[in-house]
Every structure is written in C-alpha cells, then in structure tokens.
Amino acid sequence: AQGKEVVLLDFAAAGGELGWLTHPYGKGWDLMQNIMNDMPIYMYSVCNVMSGDQDNWLRTNWVYRGEAERIFIELKFTVRDCNSFPGGASSCKETFNLYYAESDLDYGTNFQKRLFTKIDTIAPDEITVSSDFEARHVKLNVEERSVGPLTRKGFYLAFQDIGACVALLSVRVYYKKCPELLQGLAHFPETIAGSDAPSLATVAGTCVDHAVVPPGGEEPRMHCAVDGEWLVPIGQCLCQAGYEKVEDACQACSPGFFKFEASESPCLECPEHTLPSPEGATSCECEEGFFRAPQDPASMPCTRPPSAPHYLTAVGMGAKVELRWTPPQDSGGREDIVYSVTCEQCWPESGECGPCEASVRYSEPPHGLTRTSVTVSDLEPHMNYTFTVEARNGVSGLVTSRSFRTASVSINQTEPPKVRLEGRSTTSLSVSWSIPPPQQSRVWKYEVTYRKKGDSNSYNVRRTEGFSVTLDDLAPDTTYLVQVQALTQEGQGAGSKVHEFQTLSPEGSGNLAV
C-alpha cells in the first residue's frame, strides 16, 4: 500500500495563527505578512546582518507526535545574498540551523536552548541577489530533513539565525502511514511506516467505541511495514461493560439485560429483585428494599437484610445463661448470616440499666457468630439481664433498621461454688471452693453441709467466711457427701454439686493431698 503523508504541522496553512516563540522577543525572528493575489502570506523573517553576534531563535509550538516515529521536515525559505549588504557585511551569513527537542509536555514560553539538538545547517540552493529582491524575484528554496525515531509525546522545532537574511515561508512536518484498519474490535489508525526497509513499527490499536482491553490482557498491537501493510496482530479488545459484540462493533445491551465487565460473553438478563434496566446497563438496579453488597457480583439477585432470629430462649443456670435461637425465617436471600449478642443489666433496686459486655464472659466472641447458641457466664446474682440477638447479612449495613430479638432473665442466685478436695487424713477432709470474683462481694458466708454416704438421717453444717474448711472428727475410710452453698443478704445462693470425698484408711495414715 502506498504510504500516505500525514501532516503534523503546516505553518503556511495556519494563516499566521500559530504564535511561535521568538527569542529574543521582537529583535530577531518576527512574523510578517504580505499580500499576494489578495491573500495574506505569512512568513517568519530575520535580517540583522549588519549587527554581528546574532543568536536569534524561532521555536514552533509544541507538536503532538501521535504515532509518528520518524518525522519529515520540509522547509521553504529565501536567503538574501550577503553581497546585497555594504561590504558584504562581514558578520552576514547565508545559512541557518535547524534544531529539535522532544518533550512529554508543552513548556509554553519556557524556552531553553540547551534542550535542543541540532538536526542540520540549512543552506540554500539559490540565494536572492539584490536585483532580484528589488524586482520581487525572490528565489524560493525547498529543503527536507528527517528525524527519528521519536519517543516522547511531542516535540518542538527551532530555527537558529546567526546573522543571515532569511524568510521562512513554509514549515511542514509530516510522517508516513499505513492505512487504517479495524480488527479484533480494535481500530488501527493510519500509522507511520517503518523508517528502514527491514523494520516494523509497532502500533497500539485503539479499541472501537465501547470496547476496552480486558484486565491482564495484551493491548492490541500491529506492525506497520515499510510498504504500508499491516502484519503480526497481537492482543485484542473486548466489549466493555454494558455492551456486547455484534459483528465488528460493540452494541449496547438491550433493556432488561446487562453486562457487568469487559468480556466476550453476551449481555445477561437482569437477575431477581432488580428493576428493568435501561439500554447499555452495566448492572441492574435493585428493587425498593433490596440491595447489593459491594462484593456481590452484578449477576447475583438483589437481597435484603434478614428478619429477626426466631424463637430466642434464655435458660438460666445459676450465674450462667444459655442463649439459644433459630435462624431468621427470612434470610433475605443470602447465605452470609451472622449474629451479634449484646447484653444489658438492670439493678432491680434502682431500675438503672447499662451495658454489661465488660463484666460477663461469652463462650465465644459475641459478634459475628455463625452458630445459634452461646453461653454467657459471670452473671451477677439478683440482677436482671436482657440479651439482644441481632441477625445480620451482607446488606444489613446498607439499611438503618436492625433485625433483632430480645430475651430477659433474672439471676436470683450466685453461681454454684466450684469445690475441690485440698487434702485428707483418716479423720479429716480439707475442702476449698471458689466463685466468680464479681459475685464475691455479695456473699456473706459459705455454708458447708456434709454427711456420710448412705446415711440420710443426719448431716452436719459448718459456716465460714473464708474459701476453705477442714472437716474433723470423721470416720476413717468413709465416703462423705459434701456440698457448699453461698449465703447472701437476700438468701441462699445456688448450692454446689454434691461431691463424694473419702477419708483415708488407718493403714494409709498421714495427711495426703489429693
């Protein structure tokens, strides 16, 4: 295919509108206008041939490189003969220098010579002698240079005058391209042909309207050969969310359908509990009262928070409560139900209430529970407790209302003391016990009841304020039933389990610990 010239910059065609930068301002190069055939002709000229030490710069506006790798610069200019000036003007020159600088951004009026690289010295094939100049017979020169490969987003050209009498009438910058192409939902623009015969220019394709490169996928690329043919396609584009492939284009999903990501799949029908989608939908909006959690895929039906837990029961066991409940009757359409238990305690005397999370102990962390039961211990006696069990799922955070059930329980007794046998002899048993620290302040005394096993007619009672007692005057090698009960101002607390402890036989004398 025949390479096409694509113009990046055309001074002559711009009608003096480009506003190139001159340095120093106004003293060297300047824009001039002439009228030819009733049309304005613009040129940048400089002619300070008599002054010596000239260093005048003319910089183009920033030119976006686009796909160009090698650019071609065509200049049309006139140069006046130095002999047109008195004494041949010793400082007069008949050439000027062409420079370029690449950059990723437009530096605006910030001009720095050091950033520019010389392309060439531009010399005229023909100079305009004095007689020709006065007769308006100027000799127009055409010179072309090329630069490449270019890598930055754009570039500037600059023209340095060192004391010539030059008029620059045309500056045209262009590059050569392969024809545009549509392949794999990617549009390949007319693109610069390789600058050397064996080279292939790699060209990034642009996805067609409503197509994108899939995440992790390769950008569409092709190679433009020197003859203008496209070779070696790589990568592809996919229709973006809300669009599906129809021939070589991406078409919006029909109403009632959606596509939530760039993929090769077609649009899908809106899931349950969604409103009918408009054309080009990337997801389907949820019905009133239904929601989509951030992590929910768009293909999943919309869901709602669960109803409250079902059948909550609180069974008191001394200073413990076992809470049990059944799952909500309405799960909201989700599997991710978790439960949170909160506790409130109320003092019967004052009616004052407050949270009790800090003073009670749960058999497992009370938030984010997946099981439907939990045991709460370390409850204080003679206290009213209200337990709230809240059911939540992945969309509960999207609403302000909560789904919970409450159960109340009164703790009238202290927790049964935990009893241990500390030591024994043939005629004595040393017993100790403990109850949870929060309850200890309420205990007035502890009552230890003991009797021989099998003898239901008589028993002995000992009272103590401490946490241990030694039971004396016992029969050797005999099993005793021992129970400890806390006594509070309000009455008796829960009794411990009845423990069986045996005194030593006469042969095994000595006070041995168990």
Partner: antibody, heavy 120, light 109 residues
Framework: QVQLVQSGGGLVQPGGSLRLSCAAS????????MHWVRQAPGKGLEWVTV????????YYADSVKGRFTISRDNSKNTLYLQMNSLRAEDTAVYYC?????????????WGQGTLVTVSS | SSELTQPPSVSVAPGQTVTITCQGD??????ASWYQQKPGTAPKLLIY???NRPSGVPDRFSGSSSGTSASLTITGAQAEDEADYYC????????????FGGGTKLTVL
C-alpha cells in the same frame, strides 16, 4: 467594532507617577502584541514599549527603561503603562497600538491618544 | 545607525503625484510601514510590507523600496491627503525594536 479606548492621562509633577489604560474591544486581545507610542507636542512619533500577547515578554526604549512598566490583563482585555519618575521630556500624547502581526507591527489599530503633561 | 530620515515637508498640487522618501540602514533589511496622521487624531496605517494596503486605504497610495530607501507615493493627491506621514521599520542594528522617521508634512496646494 475593533477599537482601543485610552484613559488615565493628565497633569503630573516631575518625579510623579501615572498609569495609563487602554481597553480593547472587537478582537481577540490575547492574540496580539501591544505597543505604546508617544508624540511630544509638535514632534514626531516615538516608539516606547511592547508586550507580547501572553505578557511574558516586554521591551522598552532606552529613554524610558527602568521608569516605565508595560503590562496587560488579558482577562480584562486591557493594556497598561505604569509611568514612574516622570520627567518634563515625557510630556506627550501617548498612544496604545496593536501590532497586526508578530511583535513589531505594523500598527494597524491605534487608541485615540491621551495627553500626559509633566510640569511643576 | 537606527534612524530613519524623512524630508520635513513636501508639497503637491491636487491631482499630481508626490513621493515621500525614508532613508535608513534598517530599510536594507526590513520593509517600511507608512502612517498618515491628521491634526488631533491618531496615526493610521497606510502601507506595510512589500506594498500592502489595509482595507479602506485608497489605491492612490503605494509603497516601494530600494536599498536603504523606502518611498510612499500618492498618485493623484487630494486635499484630504494633507497630513503628516511617518515611515516605520524594524531596527536591524539591535539598538531599538522599531523606529519611526521624523515625519513629513504634506501640503496639498
């Protein structure tokens, strides 16, 4: 229509200051270099100063360098000349003028002129 | 030198042709522009570049240049052409940015 309207002239004592304004209308002010040119009573035209379209570049005649400052506000389409340390020889009609192309002219649009008299 | 020299005065009979000259080294490098100024008014651009007239300027005004000289010619002068005429050019010496001639008073007799 395309025009430049000047204001700010008047009588000022030697050593004093004055600010001239030149309001542009009817054209894209920010695309043109602007100049001040003065004319002493009964004398010829004398170029004073220039400012580039974006206001980044200025240049002054030796006779006013260090005393006069040219500036522009493209958002207000207005050109200014701040004149300090005025001397009797600065007495003149001051014109603002548009350079039709480039930095140096020709001057295709002129203001009506404003008289600055420096006298004690 | 960065000066432009004009004759102080020139006169012409109505309908006749008159030429006002402007001399200066800068004119070897740069074209002159010509301005007309009538009493109490701002200057008006007449000619610029090789020989370009802004719209509204009668075609009896023309410009030319040769070497260090530029000329403004009025072919068939009219009474309303009585005015001061100034040449102006870029300065090639680097001393100034742009220079004006001293002006020529044209009298139409």
């Amino acid at each position: 229509q395309v025009q430049l309207v000047q204001s700010g002239g008047g009588l000022v004592q030697p050593g004093g200051s004055l600010r001239l304004s030149c309001a542009a209308s009817g054209f894209t002010f920010s695309s043109y270099a602007m100049h001040w040119v003065r004319q002493a009573p009964g004398k010829g035209l004398e170029w004073v100063t220039v400012i580039s379209p974006d206001g980044h570049n200025t240049y002054y005649a030796d006779s006013v360098k260090g005393r006069f400052t040219i500036s522009r506000d493209n958002s207000k389409n207005t050109l200014y000349l701040q004149m300090n340390s005025l001397r009797a020889e600065d007495t003149a009609v001051y014109y603002c003028a548009r350079a039709s192309v480039g930095a140096t002219g020709p001057f295709d649009i002129w203001g009506q002129g404003t008289l600055v008299t420096v006298s004690s | 030198s960065s000066e432009l020299t004009q004759p102080p005065s020139v006169s012409v009979a109505p309908g006749q042709t008159v030429t006002i000259t402007c001399q200066g080294d800068s004119l070897r490098s740069y074209y002159a522009s010509w301005y007309q100024q009538k009493p109490g008014t701002a200057p008006k651009l007449l000619i610029y570049g090789e020989n370009n007239r802004p719209s509204g300027v009668p075609d009896r005004f023309s410009g030319s240049s040769s070497g260090t000289s530029a000329s403004l010619t009025i072919t068939g002068a009219q009474a309303e052409d009585e005015a001061d005429y100034y040449c102006n050019s870029r300065d090639s010496s680097g001393t100034h940015l742009t220079v004006f001639g001293g002006g020529t008073k044209l009298t139409v007799l």
